[in-house]
Amino acid sequence: SVTGEGQGPRSRTFTCLTNNILRIDCHWSAPELGQGSSPWLLFTSNQAPGGTHKCILRGSECTVVLPPEAVLVPSDNFTITFHHCMSGREQVSLVDPEYLPRRHVKLDPPSDLQSNISSGHCILTWSISPALEPMTTLLSYELAFKKQEEAWEQAQHRDHIVGVTWLILEAFELDPGFIHEARLRVQMATLEDDVVEEERYTGQWSEWSQPVCFQAPQRQGPLIPPWGWP
């Protein structure tokens, strides 16, 4: 999150997260300004002359959708300023002189999660935006799966799923005869050891995808977990 100090007692903390394509969503923690003040954030590119994008705050939130030619690139860098009118005059304060979108990523959830059941296992597949395909190796997924009647809090989890858009659930991981649900979320994860700190993508998990339902496959032969019996 980025913090901009207001004049007097009113300090503001802005959190601006990007889907790493064309959207930046901002949220601020300040009390409402007076009626008609129409505050906004201005994103001014520190690289592209004339590259400014206005984010009009509605309540405590705003979203800026960049034009297609301004699709976010790893080296993007913005100055964020906060603007509002007070007594008929525009007030401007600095929020962040160097906002790096790649350090504030919250991707859109994976889409089109599907299941394909065959003997002994379930293959799950999903899609990502084509715009993220060049960064496939930096996408890390977490899968949650459970019986349909259970709460998500009881779900099993599989993480460290990196650089792929499919996963196999073996029958022994599921309860035969029950309908199961699975859902997925994604985050940017720079895993290469040789990537220096200033080159990293950082952020938070996406929201969970829409769940997919599937019938657990029948187990084949004796139930022997892959690690063997103790």
Epitope: P68, E69, L72, V73, P74, S75, P130, A131, P134
Partner: nanobody, 125 residues
Amino acid sequence: QVQLVESGGGLVQAGGSLRLSCAASGRWFRFYGMGWFRQAPGKEREFVAAISNEGGSTYYADSVKGRFTISRDNAKNTVYLQMNSLKPEDTAVYYCAAGRWYYYGPEYQITYRYWGQGTQVTVSS
């Protein structure tokens, strides 16, 4: 910031070959689609060739298909344009460009965020 520096241009006889190189400084090279464009005197800058970030997809203008080959070496942060069977009409300043392909196709200049200064290619008859 990505800086692009072209090299390899020069004067060549019709039917000859040249290999252009474009070295990228800065990070993130492997995330960018790369393109070559050219501008002949008194003409608009036009698309020549492009290559996807991992090199799996290549695109060519009809006028250079079968004669030019684009390639890249992500370990060296470099993209290449091998030009064979050169013609006088290939004479132009050749520009390298880097961008994140998203909405516009690789043949559109608006796709590219970063541009080199260009290298002159002259083909004499």
